[in-house]
């Protein structure tokens, strides 16, 4: 019986060039978290495994940092980073819980309004 729920930051926005923390939290269950995947629909960004530690995909190595906790910090944001991110909690004995975060990366205010002299 899966009693847990995933709480996420929901829809978030950040400026191009900046950074953002993707964070999920599993509550209402005593199940043991054994692995957390961070994924987009078409690719894996990172895995935090209880035994193996962190694995960051080579595609994101330069701009993804593990943490805080089981979260993920995405740096040097580009507009191409806009989209949906999934936190996938592997637990024992419950099974898998999935949360989602929609990130919108905005052009910086300088880029939007032009340089002012």
């Amino acid at each position: 019986m899966m009693t847990g729920t995933i709480e996420t930051t929901g829809n978030i926005s950040a400026e191009k060039g900046g950074s953002i923390i993707l964070q999920c939290h599993l509550s209402s269950t005593t199940a043991q978290v054994t692995q957390v995947n961070w994924e987009q629909q078409d690719q894996l960004l990172a895995i935090c495994n209880a035994d193996l530690g962190w694995h960051i995909s080579p595609s994101f190595k330069d701009r993804v940092a593990p943490g805080p906790g089981l979260g993920l910090t995405l740096q040097s944001l580009t507009v191409n980073d806009t989209g949906e991110y999934f936190c996938i909690y592997h637990t024992y004995p419950d099974g898998t819980y999935t949360g989602r975060i929609f990130l919108e990366v905005l052009e910086s205010s300088v880029a939007e309004h032009g340089a002012r002299f």
Partner: antibody
Framework: DVQLQESGPGLVKPSQTLSLTCTVT?????????WNWIRQPPGKGLEWMGY???????RYNPSLKSRITISRDTSKNQFSLKLSSVTAEDTATYYC???????????WGQGTLVTVSS | DIQMTQSPSSLSASVGDRVSITCKAS??????VAWYQQKPGQAPRLLIY???YRYTGVPDRFSGSGSGTDFTLTISSLQAEDVAVYYC?????????FGQGTKLEIK
């Protein structure tokens, strides 16, 4: 329970376009997940062809990219495969499947055999 | 593309035997590997995902292990109904690719 069912012609002539539809029952294709096509030539292994996500964005196997289109009809809860300029090499059993989180395939149609022959 | 290479391509074992099938990825995929069982005339059935997590309803004689590039599917005590072709698949990034399959028969 989620069920997927492929339908379409079992015989297609070389150079023509193969068209298949997957009808999903028990789950709305606009609610979540990505909806995939996977094929298996007779006596051979499995090849992922592509998907359309619940939000409508598609992703294709680069080996097929110039020939493949996956679309959907949300009113009928169906998604479709079109593969153009087919040859005998495209003879296969075609499966539709739902991709989970992570990207495993837990739900499959029963498959439909398409033969490319004149 | 990430290639998945399975071995052996076929194997024969007796009921009650412990059987292992291996899969090697062409690059590090961490734990992003799934295993499927396919019986003649049927669609594949998911057994294991994320290298070692048994899918709902899969008997506990099936287990998966490995990380990085080397993965193993083990059947602890082979049953007659386990005769099938077994496939590994990486779920690291698109395009998802499968191993060529291992045909398992009963001696």
């Amino acid at each position: 329970d989620v069920q997927l069912q492929e339908s379409g012609p079992g015989l297609v002539k070389p150079s023509q376009t193969l068209s298949l539809t997957c009808t999903v029952t028990g789950y709305s294709i606009t609610s979540d997940y990505a909806w995939n096509w996977i094929r298996q030539p007779p006596g051979k292994g499995l090849e992922w062809m592509g998907y359309i996500s619940y939000s409508g964005s598609a992703r294709y196997n680069p080996s097929l990219k110039s020939r493949i289109t996956i679309s959907r009809d949300t009113s009928k809860n169906q998604f479709s495969l079109k593969l153009s300029s087919v040859t005998a090499e495209d003879t296969a059993t075609y499966y539709c499947a739902r991709k989970g989180y992570p990207a495993y395939f837990a739900y499959w149609g029963q498959g439909t055999l398409v033969t490319v022959s004149s | 593309d990430i290639q998945m290479t399975q071995s052996p391509s076929s194997l024969s074992a007796s009921v009650g035997d412990r059987v292992s099938i291996t899969c090697k990825a062409s690059q590090d995929v961490s734990t992003a590997v799934a295993w499927y069982q396919q019986k003649p005339g049927q669609a594949p059935r998911l057994l294991i995902y994320s290298a070692s997590y048994r899918y709902t309803g899969v008997p506990d004689r099936f287990s998966g292990s490995g990380s990085g590039t080397d993965f193993t599917l083990t059947i602890s005590s082979l049953q007659a109904e386990d005769v099938a072709v077994y496939y590994c698949q990486h779920h690291y990034s698109t395009p998802y690719t499968f191993g060529q399959g291992t045909k398992l028969e009963i001696k």
